[in-house]
Interface confidence: medium
């Protein structure tokens, strides 16, 4: 026997209290698939998060981060502070890369300069906090 709830489309829920009638999702909620017995609460992009895509009755809101921060995790579950190029984020905030390391992005960690001699090459351009060395012949 077919479940009557399977006829309820996305954007609705199957209301068992009203003879399994398809009721619209309340505002600030959504159902992305048919046949659901409740709607899901929309994600709220608050604080350091900002709204990239509004919630609709059939799809959740999507968040990104305010300027000065970048997304981390699936679906931008966290916002992490940006640093300048030549820095990395530590527990004590943004710190300059140590000598011999660089970071050419506003996120991530400082990485060691390439060791040109391992490939039998010499340093053509010296590295900086922001840029890796350039190896030459």
């Amino acid at each position: 026997l077919q479940d009557p709830c399977s006829n309820c489309p996305a954007g609705t829920f199957c209301d068992n209290n009203r003879n399994q009638i398809c009721s619209p999702c309340p505002p600030n909620s959504f159902s992305s698939a048919g046949g659901q017995r409740t709607c899901d609460i929309c994600r709220q992009c608050k604080g350091v998060f900002r709204t990239r895509k509004e919630c609709s009755s059939t799809s959740n809101a999507e968040c990104d981060c305010t300027p000065g921060f970048h997304c981390l995790g699936a679906g931008c579950s966290m916002c992490e502070q940006d640093c300048k190029q030549g820095q990395e984020l530590t527990k004590k905030g943004c710190k300059d890369c140590c000598f011999g390391t660089f970071n050419d992005q506003k996120r991530g960690i400082c990485r060691p300069w390439t060791n040109c001699s391992l490939d039998g090459k010499s340093v053509l351009v010296n590295g900086t906090k922001e840029r890796d060395v350039v190896c030459g012949p």
């Epitope: 209290n17 309340p26 600030n28 017995r37 409740t38 899901d40």
Partner: nanobody
Framework: EVQLLESGGGLVQPGGSLRLSCAAS????????VGWVRQAPGKGLEWVSA????????YYAESVKGRFTISRDNAKNTLYLQMSSLRAEDTAVYYC???????????????RGQGTQVTVSS
Amino acid sequence: EVQLLESGGGLVQPGGSLRLSCAASGFTISAEDVGWVRQAPGKGLEWVSAILDSGGSTYYAESVKGRFTISRDNAKNTLYLQMSSLRAEDTAVYYCARYVYHAGGGVTFDLRGQGTQVTVSS
């Protein structure tokens, strides 16, 4: 026991106005998320408007925005829907609705009332 009693419906000409009331008992409307849902003849339920949380944020379906106003009187524990510039397509049974939040993160409407009929016709 939670009860919702709608009133104020009737027959009105296009362009006219009506004010629907929903008297609530068994819960405090100022502490809950509440709103209005309607069902036109032969159609499914359609969400109309809501007033959410103690801050009183209001929300409207696109089809009624600028014409309908939701409000509440906390002292009377009553929810209102002021409807103006009514159109034939507003003809429906209007239900007062309370949000129900579920442990798993879902939300549904609790429609306890019998509804009030609004007919817009010349």
